[in-house]
């Protein structure tokens, strides 16, 4: 039996078929017989034999166009219809649904918990170093340094609320002015968007899913970076955020109220506090130059303490330091005085795993980092799997229509603003933008939510996290109320300004276009996603930090040429795409540069060379895990294990073999992969990928 001829696209160039005489091709069963079985026998085929069959009359019924990768996949329901089920089947179906819902909620719970533990792990690994960033005196004079410190600290502690609370306490103790704190808050806003980008990396197994998930996550990054790019210079020039927030704070006579409500934490805290509990004050103390804090552990040992005020004899450097002359004496060498000292008595130890191990913070941090990333990854995979099996047919249609459809004309423009409110509300409920955006990421990946809809939800999330901060500020004690409220308001107005810049006019929604561009690149070269993370969240901030420490002349000396080159490249790029005729022939494309400077292909080759040895064991491991997972879930035989290794697809791309239409493949998952489209595996399809 001859294989299906490759006529999805008529080939004008026969020489393309002459490369490599034989290729292994699976036999496609007769199309008329819609069987579920896959004939897996493979026969060597000489492509040369097919040459005479060049015809524009395609043997496939419909012409196959390459789908827009950003179109949402159709989640087909291949199950038995409800009306066709008997009573037993219906009961079974209901129980299955309930079971899936319970599993979904369970994995979602552990997903959120693992995010919390991940934050704790990052604080243990980099918290003290992060605290030391703040003790740099140049922050006051250099807003750029403040910005990168905000980014780095938030990235290191994986929590914008931690870095913001450090800033608040520093402002309250006059170690930092509100003016100097604003760039740090902007940086913290950028830093917090790394979490959902990390979550998106977990979906790297499926190109198309990853394209959407990564773009959906980085839309947050681009919004924050672009907002800072515009608003930081505006703030430095006009101090509008400082002025507006100061007016608001001064116009109200606030009384500190009740504590900000802990909504999601009420559920997650009982579990996360069994894993680890941190003494967050230590990072703040380091930031405030408290030498004693440098030797303190971040791992909380005593949870129940009794603080008693007692008069204690303490030594002082000189008589001038005495409480009063009559309360001063000497032992012949040292001068002593009596001071009111708060004495902390330890009553009960905490009940977490690490309480009795006495391990260094770094060790605990690394352990928790590995565990939380594994749990995060596992939960995410399971959430995506469960959602994939739930969101089919009617359910999918209803959900997708509800989420992605606009209001009827003329109110269509309101839909996005409603999404912003929903995002803000949801973030307020979960009390964390990281949690909300991280939960959103897999939904974008599997195609439940479009990036166009995810964008306003993310913007809303940014607003939601600031309302939480405002509430927390209103609940703070009198001495920090003013500063914490002003900083929370700065954060709020910064996000509002960002939304006004990058949302109302569709043309200005640059973050969507940029995220899609990055999504496309990352889908093709998946290593680039990690490079993006390292460059944008570590390398650039650390470079700016280093240059800032070297002083303004160095920063300007290096920064100005770099900025000039970036502007030049952007202008050239714009002219190349809009009006290339204006440019000389040589500049109409980037071919005048070495390939490695305008293409990722050579870099990909280099990286493949390095990662090659690790791919095979990784692949095997992945397949085994996937098989176990499929058995546990009761998925179809092959599930999506073929996603783990892209040998076939990447091999074909490398050989220049055209990507085939789905019908010409036996393995449906591979066909979808090749097309850059992902669908939930057909429950009836029996794959033989393993």
């Amino acid at each position: 039996m001859a294989p299906w001829p490759e006529l999805g696209d008529a080939q004008p160039n026969p020489s393309k078929y002459l490369e490599g005489a034989t290729s292994q091709q699976p036999i496609t069963p007769d199309k008329s017989k819609e069987t579920n079985k896959t004939d897996n026998t493979e026969v060597p085929v000489t492509k040369f034999e097919l040459l005479p069959t060049y015809s524009t009359a395609t043997l496939i019924e419909e012409p196959t166009e390459v789908d827009d990768p950003w179109n949402l996949p159709t989640l087909q329901d291949s199950g038995i219809k409800w009306s066709e089920r008997d009573a037993k089947g219906k009961i079974l179906c209901v129980f299955q649904g309930i079971g899936r819902l319970i599993l979904l909620l369970g994995f979602l719970y552990f997903f959120v918990c693992s995010l919390d533990v991940l934050s704790s792990a990052f604080q243990l690994v980099g918290g003290k170093m992060a605290g030391q960033f703040f003790s740099n005196s140049s922050i006051m004079s250099n807003p750029l340094l403040g910005l990168v410190i905000g980014v780095l600290v938030t990235v290191f502690v994986q929590s914008s609320s931690t870095s913001t609370s450090i800033v608040v306490s520093m402002v309250a103790s006059s170690l930092l002015t509100v003016r100097a704190a604003i760039p740090i808050i902007m940086g913290a806003n950028i830093g917090t968007s790394i979490t959902n980008t990390i979550v998106a990396l977990m979906q790297v197994g499926d190109r198309s899913e990853f394209r959407r998930a990564f773009a959906g996550a980085t839309v947050h990054d681009f919004f924050n970076w672009l907002s800072v790019l515009v608003l930081l210079p505006v703030e430095v020039a006009t101090h509008y955020l400082e002025v507006v927030t100061q007016l608001i704070v001064e116009s109200f006579h606030f009384k500190n109220g009740e504590d900000a409500p802990d909504l999601l934490k009420v559920i997650t805290k009982p579990f996360t506090k069994l894993i680890v509990q941190l003494d967050k004050k230590v990072i703040s103390q380091i930031a405030m130059n408290d030498e004693t804090a440098k030797n303190k552990s971040l791992v909380k040992i005593w949870c129940k303490t009794f603080t008693n005020m007692t008069q204690m004899n303490v030594t002082v450097p000189s008589m001038a330091n005495c409480t009063s002359p009559s309360l001063c004496w000497t032992d012949g060498i040292q001068i002593w005085t009596m001071k009111n000292v708060t004495y902390k008595e330890n009553i009960a130890k905490c009940q977490h795993i690490f309480v009795n191990f006495h391990l260094p913070d770094l060790a605990v941090g690394i352990i928790l980092l590995i565990i939380s990333l594994l749990v995060l990854c596992g939960c995410l995979i399971m959430i995506v799997k469960i959602l994939g099996s739930v969101l089919k047919g009617q359910v999918a249609t209803v959900i997708k229509k509800t989420i992605n459809t606009d209001f009827p004309f003329p109110f269509a423009w309101l839909t996005g603003y409603l999404a912003i409110l929903v995002g803000a509300g949801m973030t307020f409920i979960v009390q964390s933008s990281s949690v909300f955006t991280s939960a959103l990421t897999p939904l974008i990946g599997i195609g439940v939510i479009t990036i166009e809809r995810a964008y306003p939800l993310t913007l809303g999330s940014n607003i939601g996290t600031t309302t939480t901060a405002i509430l927390a500020a209103l609940a703070s004690p009198g001495n920090t109320l003013r500063s914490s409220l002003q900083i929370a308001l700065c954060h709020f107005f910064f996000n509002i300004s960002g939304i006004l810049l990058w949302y109302p006019i569709p043309f200005t929604r640059l973050p969507i276009r940029m995220a899609k561009g990055l999504g496309n690149i990352s889908a093709k070269y998946r290593w680039f996603a990690i490079f993006y993370l390292i460059i944008f969240f570590f390398l650039i901030p650390l470079t700016v930090f280093g240059l800032s420490l070297a002083g303004w002349p160095v920063l300007v000396g290096v920064g100005v040429p770099v900025v000039f080159i970036i502007i030049l490249v952007l202008c050239l790029r714009l002219l190349q795409s809009r009006c290339p005729r204006v440019l000389p022939k040589k500049l109409q494309n980037w071919n005048f540069l070495p390939l490695c400077m305008h293409s990722l292909k050579p870099w990909d080759a280099v990286i493949s060379k390095f990662t090659g040895p690790f791919q095979m064991p990784c692949c095997c491991c992945c397949r085994v895990c996937c098989r176990v997972c499929c058995l546990l879930c009761g998925c179809p035989k092959c599930c999506r294990c073929s996603k783990c290794c892209q040998d076939l697809e990447e091999g074909q791309e490398a050989q220049g073999v055209p990507v085939k239409a789905p019908e010409t493949f036996d393995n449906i998952t591979i066909s979808r992969e090749a097309q850059g489209e992902v669908r939930a595996p057909d429950s009836k399809t029996e794959c033989t990928a393993l």
Partner: antibody, heavy 120, light 107 residues
Framework: QVQLVQSGAEVVKPGASVKMSCKTS????????MHWVRQAPGQGLEWIGA????????SYNQKFKGRVTLTADKSTSTAYMELSSLRSEDTAVYYC?????????????WGQGTLVTVSS | DIQMTQSPSSLSASVGDRVTITCKAS??????VAWYQQKPGKVPKLLIY???TRHTGVPSRFSGSGSGTDFTLTISSLQPEDVATYYC?????????FGGGTKVEIK
């Protein structure tokens, strides 16, 4: 029990130096400040200075500054006082004493005293 | 330096008498005052510190009081073994200084 045993009596010429010792036992030497007090015949008590053996920190009465040196040898739990440029008015009984009442300058254990006679 | 002036320089009292010795500081010393007893040919012995705290093993007939600049040592009922010279000492400032001493005798 706490014991402070001082070296024997000394007769020295004016302008010379004298170094006396105070060997301790019955307590941890580095814990308490060691004070040196003198008493001229038929006169009152006069504080010379103190040393904290744990760190070697010292404190002197300005009256004796430059003439007195207090040292402590942790290995032998012995304190030393050296007084130079002796004059006839330095004739006195020199006591070493410790204060076990931490943070105070009230001394509660005394050595038996070393009589130093400055005579030409 | 802080001067500690003791009065009287000597006193004679009968057994069972109440004896009071006073000590005046040249400046405020708070309560950083100690009292010592020195019997003839013996080393001084600490009686009281912190103005009124009796040292271990000191009989209850010895008591101290005062604050600031004026301090008092009281022997509520003089005993033959109390014959000695009594010194006050301040430890509020360096150098530590002693009073001139009060010689107590039995009539």
């Amino acid at each position: 029990q706490v014991q402070l045993v001082q070296s024997g009596a000394e007769v020295v010429k004016p302008g010379a130096s004298v170094k006396m010792s105070c060997k301790t036992s019955g307590y941890t030497f580095i814990t308490y400040n060691m004070h040196w007090v003198r008493q001229a015949p038929g006169q009152g008590l006069e504080w010379i200075g103190a040393i904290y053996p744990g760190s070697g920190d010292t404190s002197y009465n300005q009256k004796f500054k430059g003439r007195v040196t207090l040292t402590a040898d942790k290995s032998t739990s012995t304190a030393y006082m050296e007084l130079s440029s002796l004059r006839s008015e330095d004739t006195a009984v020199y006591y070493c004493s410790i204060s076990t009442i931490i943070t105070t300058g009230a001394v509660d254990y005394w050595g038996q005293g070393t009589l130093v006679t400055v005579s030409s | 330096d802080i001067q500690m002036t003791q009065s009287p320089s000597s006193l004679s009292a009968s057994v069972g008498d109440r004896v009071t010795i006073t000590c005046k500081a040249s400046q405020d010393v708070g309560t950083a005052v100690a009292w010592y007893q020195q019997k003839p040919g013996k080393v001084p012995k600490l009686l009281i510190y912190w103005t009124s705290t009796r040292h271990t093993g000191v009989p209850s007939r010895f008591s101290g009081s005062g604050s600031g600049t004026d301090f008092t040592l009281t022997i509520s009922s003089l005993q033959p073994e109390d014959v000695a010279t009594y010194y006050c000492q301040q430890y509020s400032r360096i150098p530590l200084t002693f009073g001139g001493g009060t010689k107590v005798e039995i009539k």
